[in-house]
Interface confidence: low
């Protein structure tokens, strides 16, 4: 199960204005601009899983929505990495992965998205309310961070569905089916405009009842609005910080996901800046974060998501590079 | 401070073996890869051997089956085990560390001598 | 192995002079570069990670760019302290291997 993308709630026009235009026709121009404006940004969703059988193991799984490509990821908790979290495993699509207690399993799931088994008992064990972080370098839109934590207050023994619910994928179908349905909504959008554009547009109110942080595809704020999200990182209880683990075992049973796509707008005007939101009713944490590298110099062309499939998401040289770990 | 100091070098006949030492404080040692590189006299930079953090090895063509790198962890330290020396082997030897991300050598010692000669 | 051929081997230049050194990889190595500065005597420093990433607390008239297989090294305007030899170095695969060095001299 995840958040669906949200669209920000629009207050109905003043009696009188609506005119000619029906609310339908002027919700819809309204959703597809959003969508056209950021149809070509980034997105990194992130899903923290908890066993059933073991309220100590997690899954983490993130993954990377971008025509670009992947040079790196970093999977960290307790907070965004370099900013007080701690790093849990490092995957490089060329020289391997390398991991950190009590992370036990980190792998390549598909060319765009990965998965980190986390296991733990006592002083080792990650709590509940830990966030976890996942921070894609890719070329050519820069650095990329998501954050997520599991729910405080549910059960997973209970509220397990035996699978885990669709997950989004950024393979070629997907992206190009999405390119589709977007190229299609903004041509209809433009159509709408001429067709409406002698028309007198509705005054639209603004919400002041949904301050979210953008976490939905469908609401790409401005560098203004952006810039009024940045409040200090509230992170977890830091009780639950990584001791080592010497033992891991693997263990199955019924799951339950809690699944955080997000959406990060571009923020090229300075470092690490975060935006933090509670999702309502869910209990879970994201951040988003856009930092663009120091330079502004190129970042290598290579095999991305939907290009070239080797049998190793990692590519043709994984194995021979030097932090694989065995 | 991020610190790395090599020490063990010194004269060694040709066929002989050395063992060099690098003691690294200032950072979580056990996280990050760690390396030799080597530099003849007025020669450039050569790699002689890395360890990552899970304690795989690795190594060129050159010095293959002849040095041994290994590390341990409890002591913060780094080793070089030379056997078999040649004259060609003659160089300074630094310690280098690598960290997490970036992958390239972010920290080095300031080198310790080995000289192979009869 | 990935072979780094470094050009040019040395050069002259002034004080205040732009200075630009060249680093071809023999095959893709994606921005797995460095850049290291080398002084006589002493260890080498890394100036550039990640082919065009400044290292913390050295100066911005050292600039890297490429990717792929063509990596440069920008000094924009060379101050005393710059002459020095100069190395790129590959960490995308092993065996590691170094460009064989630029030499920047007093012209």
């Known amino acids: 199960m995840r958040t669906e993308a949200q669209v920000p709630a629009l207050q109905p026009p003043e009696p009188g204005l609506e005119g000619a235009m029906g609310h339908r026709t002027l919700v819809l121009p309204w959703v597809l601009l959003t969508l056209c404006v950021t149809a070509g940004t980034p997105e990194v969703w992130v899903q923290v899983r908890m066993e059933a059988t073991e309220l100590s193991s997690f899954t983490i799984r993130c993954g990377f929505l971008g025509s670009g490509s992947i040079s790196l990821v970093t999977v960290s908790w307790g907070g965004p990495n370099g900013a007080g979290g701690t790093t849990l495993a490092v995957l490089h699509p060329e020289r391997g992965i390398r991991q950190w207690a009590p992370a036990r399993q980190a792998r390549w799931e598909t060319q765009s998205s990965i998965s980190l088994i986390l296991e733990g008992s006592g002083a080792s064990s990650p709590c509940a309310n830990t966030t976890f972080c996942c921070k894609f370098a890719s070329f050519p839109e820069g650095s990329w961070e998501a954050c997520g934590s599991l729910p405080p207050s549910s059960d997973p023994g209970l509220s397990a569905p035996p699978t885990p619910a669709p997950i989004l994928r950024a393979d070629l179908a997907g992206i190009l089916g999405v390119s589709g349905v977007l190229l299609f909504g903004c041509v209809y959008l433009l159509h709408l405009l001429r067709r409406h554009k002698h028309r007198p547009a509705p005054r639209l109110q603004p919400s002041r009842t949904s301050p979210q942080a953008p976490r939905a595809r469908a609401w790409a704020p401005s560098q203004a609005s952006q810039a009024a999200l940045h409040v200090p990182y509230a992170t977890i209880n830091t009780s639950c910080r990584p001791a080592t683990l010497d033992t891991a075992h693997p263990h199955g049973g019924p799951s339950w996901w809690a699944s955080l796509p997000t959406h990060a707008a571009h923020r090229p005007q300075g470092p690490a800046a975060w935006a933090s939101t509670p999702i309502p009713a869910r209990g879970s944490f994201v951040s988003v974060e856009n930092g663009l590298y120091a330079q502004a110099g190129e970042r290598p062309p290579h095999t991305g998501p939907g290009l070239t499939l080797f049998p190793d998401p990692r590519g043709p040289r994984a194995m021979e590079g030097p932090l694989g770990v065995r | 401070e991020v610190q790395l100091v090599e020490s063990g070098g010194g004269l060694v006949q040709p066929g002989g073996s050395l063992r060099l030492s690098c003691a690294a404080s200032?950072?979580?040692?056990?996280?990050?890869?760690m390396h030799w590189v080597r530099q003849a006299t007025g020669k450039g930079l050569e790699w002689v051997a890395g360890?990552?953090?899970?304690?795989?090895?690795y190594y060129p063509g050159s010095v293959k089956g002849r040095f041994t790198i290994s590390r341990e962890n409890a002591k913060n330290s780094l080793y070089l085990q030379m056997n078999s020396l040649r004259a060609g082997d003659t160089a300074i030897y630094y310690c280098a560390r690598e960290g997490q991300w970036p992958y390239g050598m972010d920290v080095w010692g300031q080198g310790t001598t080995v000289t192979v000669s009869s | 192995d990935i072979q780094m051929t470094q050009s040019p081997s040395s050069l002259s230049a002034s004080v205040g002079d732009r200075v630009t050194i060249t680093c071809r990889a023999s095959?893709?190595?994606?921005?797995?570069l460095g850049w290291y500065q080398q002084k006589p005597g002493k260890a080498p420093k890394r100036l550039i990670y990640s082919a065009s990433s400044l290292q913390s607390g050295v100066s911005s008239r050292f600039s890297g760019s490429g990717s792929g297989t063509e990596f440069t090294l920008t000094i924009s305007s060379l101050q005393p302290e710059d002459f020095a030899t100069y190395y790129c170095l590959q960490s995308n695969s092993y065996p590691l291997t170094f460009g064989g060095g630029t030499k920047v001299e007093i012209k």
């Open positions: 095959q893709g190595i994606r921005n797995d």
């Open positions: 360890i990552d953090n899970a304690g795989e090895t």
């Open positions: 200032g950072f979580t040692f056990s996280r990050d890869d």
